[in-house]
């Protein structure tokens, strides 16, 4: 007898989910060297402990300890570069500058980057149907947890100068309902995080607008001064100029000191 | 090490024309913005166009626009200004300079610069 | 465009800190850049993003950038700092200017 199956409004799970969380997990730890001791498929079972046989809409930060664990990592908390609605350029930009991190840049936000998962309560199948939506079915789902539990860890082990990438081409440059936003921004710890500076990246060849002075990056900047950090914001105006050095990864000056 | 080498200037008459060219050598050419900057004698800098890497983009001052076109040739390591309509005020030295990478617009390395002086 | 005010000269005796200020409409939303140029020499780079100091160059220069006014400070002068300094901003398409330059004079 067919069980019946919740129908959810997300995306299922990516296809071949385990196989690219393993895959992923391997070839992290071959290319890092600090996290050579990593089991993988400890990391892959603590993953999957984490929603398996979970109601998709029960999920918790505490579900996913054992993962966080297992995957605990010292980046410099100098060197950290946080992102909002402009992920890949951020990306581009860790990769030619490689003494800075994103999230994605770590164990965890590699493993998971771009991918969707849930479960079923009672079953220890993987749902490649349909997953929760955020907004039309519920906010605590895997993938969401999953995100404000590494997020806010990351936002913690911050210190000193913190860079934010933002996207100048949006009409809400700041989102205060972005994982930035919302989770980011209240986790800097203010002992240790002198300075929030943000990026705003524009888009048009000809824009020379001053985005700094928009309203939502006001917004940021009262946020943050009233968290006892100071905040800068500069306009970035080229950003093909990331791309000129990724298509030239061997060219060394594009990523050292000058 | 990175070198930067002008060449093409003179004297021309109002009304005539140059071109500018700067052979670089020891990095990534086509991986960096590069610039003409100009001094006119006991004067200070003028920042006079800019070009991308690929070369998609093109940027010029206001005083020089319709005049001068920047182009470079990356095969070649090359960096080119063609000056047509040349006045008076565009007596200068050219300097040839690249710019700095990722979120930085400034420069980073400077030529030694090449001379351009419209007279009669 | 955002125009940047330098002062014509500054003057110091050899030892003291010289500050060369940089002045524009909301400077401190854009990195500011500085440079020496020597006579008869072409620029040199001695700051960048406001603060970043170029490999090779002294430990004495340094840079800051807050409300409407960037700062060059080279600390403990030298007679090797006579020089022009300028400073420079980029704000975006074609709008990248320089200050009109300052004279250092090493007393």
């Known amino acids: 007898v067919p069980r019946w199956r919740q129908q959810w409004s997300g995306p299922g799970t990516t296809k071949r989910f385990p196989e690219t969380v393993l895959a992923r997990c391997v070839k992290y730890t071959e290319i890092h060297p600090e996290m050579r001791h990593v089991d993988c498929q400890s990391v892959w079972d603590a993953f999957k402990g984490a929603f398996i046989s979970k109601h998709p809409c029960n999920i918790t930060e505490e579900d996913y300890q054992p993962l966080m664990k297992l995957g605990t990592q010292t980046v410099p908390c100098n060197k950290i570069l946080l992102w909002s609605r402009i992920k890949d350029l951020a990306h581009q930009f860790t990769q030619v500058q490689r003494d800075m991190f994103t999230l994605e840049d770590t164990l965890l936000g590699y493993l998971a980057d771009d991918l969707t998962w849930c479960g079923e309560f009672n079953t220890s199948k993987i749902n490649y149907q349909s997953c929760p939506d955020w907004r039309k079915d519920c906010s605590n789902n895997p993938v969401s947890v999953f995100w404000k539990t590494v997020s806010r860890r990351f936002a913690e082990a911050a210190c000193d100068v913190v860079h934010v990438m933002l996207n100048g081409s949006r009409s809400k440059i700041f989102d205060k309902n972005s994982t930035f936003g919302s989770v980011e921004v209240h986790n800097l710890q203010p002992e240790k995080v002198q300075t929030l500076e943000a990026w705003v990246i524009h888009g048009g060849r000809e824009d020379s607008r001053d985005l700094c002075q928009d309203p939502t990056i006001k917004e940021l900047e009262s946020i943050i001064s009233k968290r006892n950090i100071q905040f800068s914001c500069k306009n970035i105006y080229r950003p093909d100029k990331f791309l000129q050095c990724v298509k030239n990864p061997e060219d060394s000056s594009c990523t050292s000191e000058i | 090490q990175v070198q930067l080498v002008e060449s093409g200037g003179g004297l021309v008459q109002p009304g005539g024309s140059l071109r500018l060219s700067c052979a670089a050598s020891?990095?990534?050419?086509?991986?960096?913005?590069m610039n003409w900057v100009r001094q006119a004698p006991g004067k200070g800098l003028e920042w006079v166009s800019g070009?991308?890497?690929?070369?998609?983009?093109?940027y010029y001052a206001d005083s020089v626009k319709g005049r001068f076109t920047i182009s470079r040739d990356n095969s070649k390591n090359t960096l080119y200004l063609q000056m047509n309509s040349l006045r008076a005020e565009d007596t200068a030295v050219y300097y040839c300079?690249?710019?700095?990478?990722?979120?930085?617009?400034?420069?980073?390395?400077w030529g030694q610069g090449t001379l351009v002086t419209v007279s009669s | 465009d955002i125009e940047l005010t330098q002062p014509p000269s500054v003057s110091v005796a050899p030892g003291q800190t010289a500050r060369i200020s940089c002045s524009g409409d909301?400077?401190?939303?854009?990195?500011v850049y500085w440079y020496q140029q020597k006579p008869g020499q072409a620029p040199v780079l001695v700051i960048y993003?406001?603060?970043k100091r170029p490999s090779g160059i002294p430990e004495r220069f340094s840079g800051s950038n807050s409300g409407n006014t960037a700062t060059l400070t080279i600390s403990g002068t030298q007679a090797e700092d006579e020089a022009d300094y300028y400073c420079?901003?980029?704000?975006?398409?074609?709008?990248?200017?320089f200050g009109g330059g300052t004279k250092l004079t090493v007393l």
């Open positions: 300079a690249r710019d700095l990478p990722l979120v930085y617009t400034g420069f980073a390395y």
């Open positions: 020891g990095f990534t050419f086509s991986s960096y913005y």
């Open positions: 070009i991308s890497g690929d070369p998609s983009n093109t």
């Open positions: 909301n400077l401190r939303h854009y990195y």
């Open positions: 993003g406001d603060s």
């Open positions: 420079q901003t980029y704000t975006g398409g074609a709008s990248l200017v």
